[in-house]
């Protein structure tokens, strides 16, 4: 799950802390939704397999001018850095369906926390 | 206040070793990539290496093979392992925190000195 | 790689003058239609400091006289009115492929 760049090598799992505030983050956004996350925008579904982080803020970079993911956009980046390659992009974009960014964060919440309940951290 | 401190820097003969620190306050380390850039005296930036929050590696080919980067979240630390260095290593070396792709190096360190020379 | 290219590589100017810095690419460092350019101030004896992520969005605590534009290839630097703490040499930088790159620098001196 951890992206590869073209000059990456594969190494321990991310820390727990990195998801455990990556969750703490999706969490208040979910929470503190009033008005419709980020007026409605819709988004690309993903594949939450392998490349999930990746996969997770290639969807999101697209949501422009909403404060509220900001913040998940950037903690996403820390996953993944560097872009994956260009071979690996493809797999990432399976661009079939759309859905509102609540939809998208409330799913990619509730796999994190299977994730980390297995404490499956990468 | 975000703050990245780095040491570990010095005279090196060619072919010495040397290990860099990076010290990491006000933020929470683990959750961010990190990178070291370097400035040779008087020229301009290049990027050294990228550790992401899962320990992916990244490197540009100058320094493959003979450098590596590392991270210990628990003592809030980088690292900058420099193997084989030589003349053309000689530079101001930083440590920033890498937002990613998406968002550049957004806080640095003031950087230490490695200077290669017999 | 990707070579980037800055002009001029210096520039004089006063206080108060609009200040325009380019910066090419050696090939399109566009993705998904962002463009992957950052640009950093930084002063002599300094750490570098990123102003503008993605060509265009200014980091926050920037003052708001700096702005970035250009896609493709073709990217643009602006400081609307040159204030005297402005004096500093300013690096683009790519991050659509690795390696990550940076342009050799563009000084902005006092005239």
């Known amino acids: 799950l951890t992206c590869l760049g073209g000059f990456a090598s594969p190494g321990p799992v991310p820390p727990s802390t990195a998801l455990r505030e990556l969750i703490e983050e999706l969490v208040n956004i979910t929470q503190n939704q009033k008005a419709p996350l980020c007026n409605g925008s819709m988004v690309w579904s993903i594949n939450l397999t392998a490349g999930m982080y990746c996969a997770a803020l290639e969807s999101l970079i697209n949501v422009s001018g909403c404060s509220a993911i900001e913040k998940t956009q950037r903690m996403l980046s820390g996953f993944c850095p560097h872009k994956v390659s260009a071979g690996q992009f493809s797999s990432l974009h399976v661009r079939d369906t759309k859905i509102e960014v609540a939809q998208f964060v409330k799913d990619l919440l509730l796999h994190l926390k299977k994730l980390f309940r297995e404490g499956q951290f990468n | 206040e975000v703050q990245l401190v780095e040491s570990g820097g010095g005279l090196v003969q060619p072919g010495g070793s040397l290990r860099l620190s990076c010290a990491a306050s006000g933020f929470t380390f683990s959750s961010y990539a990190m990178s070291w850039v370097r400035q040779a005296p008087g020229k301009g930036l290049e990027w050294v290496a990228s550790?992401?929050?899962?320990?992916?590696?990244y490197y540009p080919d100058s320094v493959k093979g003979r450098f590596t980067i590392s991270r210990d979240n628990a003592k809030n630390s980088l690292y900058l392992q420099m193997n084989s260095l030589r003349a053309e290593d000689t530079a101001v070396y930083y440590c920033?925190?890498?937002?990613?792709?998406?968002?550049?190096?957004?806080?640095w360190g003031r950087g230490t000195l490695v200077t290669v020379s017999s | 790689d990707i070579q980037m290219t800055q002009s001029p590589s210096s520039l004089s100017a006063s206080v108060g003058d609009r200040v325009t810095i380019t910066c090419r690419a050696s090939q399109s460092v566009d993705h998904f239609g962002w463009s992957l350019v950052h640009w950093y101030q930084q002063k002599p004896g300094k750490a570098p400091k990123l102003l503008i992520y993605?060509?265009?969005n200014l980091e926050s605590g920037v003052p708001s006289r700096f702005s970035g534009s250009g896609s493709g290839t073709d990217f643009t630097l602006t400081i609307s009115s040159l204030q005297p703490e402005d004096f500093a040499t300013y690096y683009c930088q790519q991050s659509n492929e690795d390696p990550w790159t940076f342009g050799g620098g563009t000084k902005v001196e006092i005239k």
């Open positions: 920033a925190r890498n937002e990613g792709y998406y968002f550049g190096l957004t806080q």
């Open positions: 993605r060509a265009s």
């Open positions: 550790i992401s929050t899962g320990d992916t590696t």
